[in-house]
């Protein structure tokens, strides 16, 4: 019995930050959970983790050097990433696991979200020479 997750298929980012929402077919309320975000086709890099259970403020952290934070409501976890660069362009997968109460539950792998970080081009405006 797996939880379903909905993610936006594509996020194109002009700035260096992005908010990615993971909407679950399951209520987070009154449960102990571990919400995480993974980078790459094989989910090789754990980008961000949020641990909580609504009786205390969820703790959000990254072990892999990403700048991240998270917002949690009844059925949605929103990860906010900043200081992103072009080489962070990749596919990102949401994951949720419920540790308590039993039984342990996690989600069906989603289709992921492609986050495309656009390169910033510095425009130099040419001023015509003054006579």
């Amino acid at each position: 019995n797996k939880i379903l997750v909905k993610q936006s298929p594509l996020l194109v980012v002009d700035s260096n930050e992005v908010s990615l929402s993971c909407r679950y077919s399951y209520n987070l309320l009154a449960k102990e959970f571990r919400a995480s975000l993974y980078k790459g086709v094989n989910s090789d890099v754990e980008v961000c983790v949020g641990n909580g259970n609504f009786t205390y403020q969820p703790q959000v952290y990254s072990k892999t050097g990403f700048n991240c934070d998270g917002d949690f409501d009844n059925e949605t976890v929103t990860f906010r990433l900043w200081n992103l660069h072009v080489n962070h362009t990749d596919i990102y997968f949401c994951k949720i696991e419920f540790m308590y109460p039993p039984p342990y539950l996690d989600n069906e792998r989603s289709n992921g979200t492609i986050i495309h970080i656009k390169e910033k081009h510095l425009c130099h405006t040419q001023s015509s020479p003054k006579l």
Epitope: Q59, K63, Y104
Partner: antibody
Framework: QVQLQQSGPELVKPGTSVRISCEAS????????IHWVKQRPGQGLEWIGC????????NYNEKFKDKATLIVDTSSNTAYMQLSRMTSEDSAVYFC?????????????WGAGTTVTVSS | DIQMNQSPSSLSASLGDTITITCHAS??????LNWYQQKPGNIPKLLIY???NLHTGVPSRFSGSGSGTGFTLTISSLQPEDIATYYC?????????FGGGTKLEIK
């Protein structure tokens, strides 16, 4: 209070196997990993591997992959480590310890250790 | 695997002294570094987690600092009960690894 209760000392013959246990109490078993750590006499600490009771996923130190097998019984809140093909190098104290599944980076509670002696 | 190099391997100091133990990681582990104390014949006890956070019940004379690859454990105003071996441990990535230990003795 939170406790990890380990099984008693073992004297085993070379080439045989041994299974040691770690019974958890005083906390939600499925909220924490159980890790196993080896300490040879007068030596340092060596991480063997861990198991998460929720989905029984395991992580092993490559060095111990063919030596240790980790299992859990959630009905009794007990973790087990089986060590196979015992040699004198396996004589050590083995500790079980825990780390939080969602906040997994340190070991906050330790068992008293199980002394395993390999001798013919 | 991430190697954790701890120094010195042994240390002799007088009561009331301030001592420093260092731990060097073979790659960037950010702040995912913990310190443990193991008294002779006893189990390891968590002192400091995430480089600088004091575990519950640990005296404030213990402190930790550092990030990236370099970390230090400082014990100020050394007490007789501080005689122990101290270990660092990285919790950034599996397999978790420990430093070789620093054996602290009183002069």
């Amino acid at each position: 209070q939170v406790q990890l209760q380990q099984s008693g000392p073992e004297l085993v013959k070379p080439g045989t196997s041994v299974r040691i246990s770690c019974e958890a109490s005083g906390y939600t078993f499925t909220s924490y990993y159980i890790h196993w750590v080896k300490q040879r006499p007068g030596q340092g600490l060596e991480w063997i591997g861990c198991i998460y009771p929720g989905n029984v996923n395991t992580n092993y130190n490559e060095k111990f992959k063919d030596k240790a097998t980790l299992i859990v019984d959630t009905s009794s809140n007990t973790a087990y480590m089986q060590l196979s093909r015992m040699t004198s190098e396996d004589s050590a104290v083995y500790f079980c310890t825990r780390s939080h599944y969602g906040l997994d980076w340190n070991f906050d509670v330790w068992g008293a250790g199980t002394t395993v002696t390999v001798s013919s | 695997d991430i190697q954790m190099n701890q120094s010195p391997s042994s240390l002799s100091a007088s009561l009331g002294d301030t001592i420093t133990i260092t731990c060097h990681a073979s790659q960037n582990i950010y702040v995912w570094l913990n310190w443990y104390q193991q008294k002779p014949g006893n189990i390891p006890k968590l002192l400091i987690y995430k480089a600088s956070n004091l575990h519950t019940g640990v005296p404030s004379r213990f402190s930790g600092s550092g990030s990236g690859t370099g970390f230090t454990l400082t014990i100020s105003s050394l007490q007789p009960e501080d005689i122990a071996t101290y270990y660092c441990q990285q919790g950034q990535t599996y397999p978790y690894t420990f430093g070789g230990g620093t054996k602290l003795e009183i002069k």
